[in-house]
């Protein structure tokens, strides 16, 4: 026997209190698949998060980060502070890359300059806090 709830489309829930009719999701909630017995609460993009896509009756809201921050984690579950190129984020805030390391992005950690001699090459352009060395013949 077919479950009557399977006829309820996305954007609705199967209302057990009303003879399993399909009822529309309440405001600020959604159902992205058919046959659901409840709707899901919409994600709210507050604080350092901002709304990239509004919640609809059939899809959740999507967040990104306010300027000066970048997304981390699946679905932008966290926002992390940006640093300048040539810096990395530590527990004490943004710190300049140590000598011999660089970071060419606003996120991530400082990485060691390439060791040209490992490939039998010499340094063509010196490295900086923001740029890796350029190896030459």
């Amino acid at each position: 026997l077919q479950d009557p709830c399977s006829n309820c489309p996305a954007g609705t829930f199967c209302d057990n209190n009303r003879n399993q009719i399909c009822s529309p999701c309440p405001p600020n909630s959604f159902s992205s698949a058919g046959g659901q017995r409840t709707c899901d609460i919409c994600r709210q993009c507050k604080g350092v998060f901002r709304t990239r896509k509004e919640c609809s009756s059939t899809s959740n809201a999507e967040c990104d980060c306010t300027p000066g921050f970048h997304c981390l984690g699946a679905g932008c579950s966290m926002c992390e502070q940006d640093c300048k190129q040539g810096q990395e984020l530590t527990k004490k805030g943004c710190k300049d890359c140590c000598f011999g390391t660089f970071n060419d992005q606003k996120r991530g950690i400082c990485r060691p300059w390439t060791n040209c001699s490992l490939d039998g090459k010499s340094v063509l352009v010196n490295g900086t806090k923001e740029r890796d060395v350029v190896c030459g013949p």
């Epitope: 829930f13 009822s23 999701c25 309440p26 017995r37 409840t38 709707c39 899901d40 609460i41």
Partner: nanobody
Amino acid sequence: EVQLLESGGGLVQPGGSLRLSCAASGFTVSAEDVGWVRQAPGKGLEWVSAILDSGGSTYYAESVKGRFTISRDNAKNTLYLQMSSLRAEDTAVYYCARVVYHSGGGVTFDLRGQGTQVTVSS
């Protein structure tokens, strides 16, 4: 026991106004998410308006924005829907609804009243 009693419906000409009332008992309207749902003849339920986040925000369906206003009287534990510039397509049974948040994270709503009929016709 949660009870919702709607009133204020009737027959009105296009362009006219009505104010619906919903007297609640068994819960406090100021502490919950509440609103209005309607069902037009031969159609499914449609959310019209709601007061959410304990009054922090309001919701209106696109079709009623600028024409309908939701409000509540905490002392009377009553929810209202002021409807103006009414159109034939607003003809429906209007129900007071309480949004229900389930422990598992799901959301549904309760309709406990019989609704009030609004007919817009010349």
